[in-house]
């Protein structure tokens, strides 16, 4: 049983670090292997995670921490049975993968704006909480090619667009995901979509 | 409120041994690590050891290695430190404090300190 | 091991100016922005005191005129303004596989 790709690990920054890698056969990961991972500190503990099949020959781990320093760095093992088969670490500030927003409401009660608000998904003790900027996306579910991006990089979790700059009497869906340029972090998973029927008055045509 | 009451002051001879307490009360003794740090008179701050009182497992500074033991007794929520064939050098005061691992070890409460004078 | 260089030694700053105490690594002790590092205050007759943890957070009920900044090996604690309360011993900390203790800064006030 050898290691075919070697585990690569991100972190939420908060509490869970997931690690994927892939066996050079199909493995039955959670009775065969187990990832022992320890932070480097003085009486820290190791800790054991029990994988996941991810695909046939593929292993996905989730690394529970209490929390995350960005000084933090962590030893990896990876064990099957007896056998040492990898042997790594892994600094969580410098794979970050923030966690997706949540809540995403379109308000449609506003003249003719749409205000759209979504929850920061960390706590405001949390690093991150104060360095996320956003990407929302918006596409019509009746035209493929109406689909736009709006970059968010004030800290509020909302945009405000006219609903004018929308097609009116049809729905459209609208997703959110979170960076953060500081750890130069990846994107987040979008967010849950929600769909809402845009629909404002056209203004009286001036002859 | 979160107290550590250490030992009243000693005065031994050269080549005995000591034992000081440190009894924590106000929170739960297995969670917090517990720190003890030696200060000479005018000096700056050493760090001896730390101790894990949910499992006792101890780590020390090289140096005090020998010289220092640390112990806790969960029942009583107390740490102790023996110290060993003590010299002149071994005059000083010693603070216990506790640390939490999600502070990376930040000492947040201090006990008053024992002072430990050697002489003949 | 890492040797932890406070300077200055000892400070006079007059009442309500700013103080600025550093610690410098003798290697980096951060990867990319906070270290381990605390901060502590001692008056005479005193245990220390945690002011600060992890670099720059402020320890639950110390004034916000004490701040703390820096990574790699170059770390600041600042006090402004300063009262007379702040005439003390200040000393940084840095721990991983060891605890080290910087060799403390003097503050007086005038």
């Known amino acids: 049983m050898k290691v075919l790709q070697e585990p690569t690990c991100v972190s939420d920054y908060m509490s869970i670090s997931t690690c994927e890698w892939k066996m050079n056969g199909p493995t039955n990961c959670s009775t065969e292997l187990r990832l022992l991972y320890q932070l480097v500190f003085l009486l820290s503990e190791a800790h054991t995670c029990i994988p996941e099949n991810n695909g046939g020959a593929g292993c996905v781990c989730h690394l529970l921490m209490d929390d995350v320093v960005s000084a933090d760095n962590y030893t990896l093992d990876l064990w099957a049975g007896q056998q040492l088969l990898w042997k790594g670490s892994f600094k969580p500030s410098e794979h970050v993968k923030p966690r997706a927003p949540g809540n995403l409401t379109v308000h449609t009660n506003v003249s003719d704006t749409l205000l759209l608000t979504w929850s920061n998904p960390y706590p405001p003790d949390n690093y991150l909480y104060n360095h996320l900027t956003y990407a929302v996306n918006i596409w019509s579910e009746n035209d493929p090619a109406d689909f736009r991006i709006y970059n968010v990089t004030y800290l509020e979790p909302s945009l405000r667009i006219a609903a004018s700059t929308l097609k009116s009497g049809i729905s459209y869906r609208a997703r959110v995901r979170a960076w953060a340029q500081c750890y130069n972090t990846t994107w987040s998973e979008w967010s849950p979509s929600t769909k809402w029927h845009n629909s404002y008055r056209e203004p009286f045509e001036q002859h | 409120e979160v107290q550590l009451q250490q030992s009243g002051p000693v005065l031994v001879k050269p080549g005995a041994s000591v034992k000081m307490s440190c009894k924590a009360s106000g929170y739960t003794f297995t969670d917090y690590y517990m720190n003890w740090v030696k200060q000479r008179h005018g000096k700056s701050l050493d760090w001896i050891g730390t101790?894990?009182?949910?499992?006792?497992?101890?780590g020390y500074n090289q140096k005090f290695k020998g010289k220092a033991t640390l112990t806790v007794d969960k029942s009583s929520s107390t740490a102790y430190m023996e110290l060993n064939s003590l010299t002149s050098e071994d005059s000083a005061v010693y603070f216990c404090?506790?640390?939490?691992?999600?502070?990376?070890?930040?000492?947040?409460?201090w006990g008053q300190g024992t002072s430990v004078t050697v002489s003949s | 091991d890492i040797v932890l260089t406070q300077s200055p030694a000892s400070l006079v700053v007059s009442l309500g100016q700013r103080a600025t105490i550093s610690c410098r690594a003798s290697k980096s002790v951060s990867t990319s922005g906070y270290g381990y590092i605390h901060w502590y205050r001692q008056k005479p007759g005193q245990p220390p005191k945690l002011l600060i943890y992890l670099v720059s957070n402020l320890e639950s009920g110390v004034p916000a005129r004490f701040s703390g900044s820096g990574s790699g090996t170059d770390f600041t604690l600042n006090i402004h303004p300063v009262e007379e309360e702040d005439a003390a011993t200040y000393y940084c900390?840095?721990?991983?596989?060891?605890?080290?203790f910087g060799g403390g800064t003097k503050l007086e006030i005038k």
């Open positions: 900390q840095h721990i991983r596989e060891l605890y080290t």
């Open positions: 404090a506790r640390s939490l691992l999600r502070r990376r070890g930040a000492m947040d409460y």
């Open positions: 101790i894990n009182p949910y499992n006792g497992g101890t």
